[in-house]
């Protein structure tokens, strides 16, 4: 009799475990659905608001010609700055012309004043050659003014109206860049 009760108890316990598993799976599935829903809603809202405002740049970004720029409010090292930009679908600022440099430095003066801002420029440790993050070379007029005395990896930053260089592991603000959305009108 006792053995029978014990067997029934074990069967009930097994059933309970299976139900808990099923509930856990359901909760996970529900969470996943909610997450997907949140994404869909966010995308719809983003699409609707950009269609309504036909804004080429996201909120808190600055537009100049075909580019949108974001000036960070936090400090980070060069590599983390790049990752922060990537999360927003952008990369660190890549300055292609003197006109773009003038726009950036002019905007920074208005926003924050004379601080250091990482850009997507770094120096090859062996050759000492400067390269933008996409592998292209900076134009001669857009090379950092001073060579950093650091034995570590060296990266480029903007300060006032100059391009300078520093150890990539120092903390600075940073500027992200992405392409502005073209208006379909």
């Amino acid at each position: 009799k006792l053995l029978q009760v014990s067997t029934i108890a074990m069967q009930q316990q097994e059933k309970l475990i299976q139900q808990e598993r099923a509930l856990l799976n359901f909760t996970e599935w529900k969470r996943s659905c909610a997450l997907q829903m949140k994404y869909c809603q966010a995308f719809m809202q983003n699409s609707l608001s950009s269609a309504h405002n036909s804004s080429p740049c996201p909120n808190n970004w600055i537009q100049n010609r075909e580019s949108c720029y974001y000036v960070s409010e936090i400090w980070s090292i060069w590599h983390t700055s790049q990752e922060n930009c990537l999360k927003e679908g952008s990369t660190l600022l890549q300055i292609e012309s003197k006109e773009e440099m003038d726009f950036i430095t002019g905007s920074l003066r208005k926003i924050k004043g004379s601080y250091d801002y990482w850009v997507g420029l770094s120096q090859d440790g062996h050759s000492g050659r400067w390269l933008w993050q996409d592998g292209s070379s900076p134009s001669p007029g857009l090379l950092p003014a001073e060579r950093s005395q650091s034995a570590n990896q060296v990266c480029g930053y903007v300060k006032s109206n100059s391009l300078l260089s520093s150890n990539c592991s120092t903390w600075k603000y940073f500027i992200c860049e992405k392409y502005a959305l073209r208006s379909s009108v």
Epitope: K38, Y39, A42, G89
Partner: nanobody
């Protein structure tokens, strides 16, 4: 959710080449940027190369000029062409997908299982 599967790793001589592939499935529409990271034994995981959904590209200074990242949107695949490989490139290479930030949600990055790349001298 987004699932990532890497392939193409292996053993190669110094100066040689390898091409890594990362096949993505799931909610790929939610991704802002695709990337490759690597982790050598006893070191932190580091960004190697990334490509945004706009096609903007970023390389780590250590691989700039040697590695090339590309993406085939139709196949939902990201590639990393690695040339002039050095022993210091030896690491496990991970595919990464960064989702669009959604207000009120803390969704982290998506990661593949990793593929081993060994460069012998």
């Amino acid at each position: 959710q987004v699932q990532l599967q890497e392939s193409g790793g292996g053993l190669v001589q110094s100066g040689g080449s390898l091409r890594l592939s990362c096949a993505a499935s799931g909610s790929v529409f939610s991704i802002n940027a695709w990337g490759w990271y690597r982790q050598a034994p006893g070191k932190q995981r580091e960004l190697v190369a990334a490509i945004t959904n706009q096609g903007r590209i970023a390389y780590a200074p250590s691989v700039n000029g040697r590695f090339t990242i590309s993406r085939d949107s139709a196949k939902n695949t990201v590639y990393l062409q690695m040339n002039s490989l050095k022993p210091e490139d030896t690491a496990v290479y991970y595919c990464n997908a960064k989702p669009t930030p959604v207000y009120g949600s803390t969704v982290g990055d998506y990661w593949g299982q990793g593929t081993q790349v060994t460069v012998s001298s």
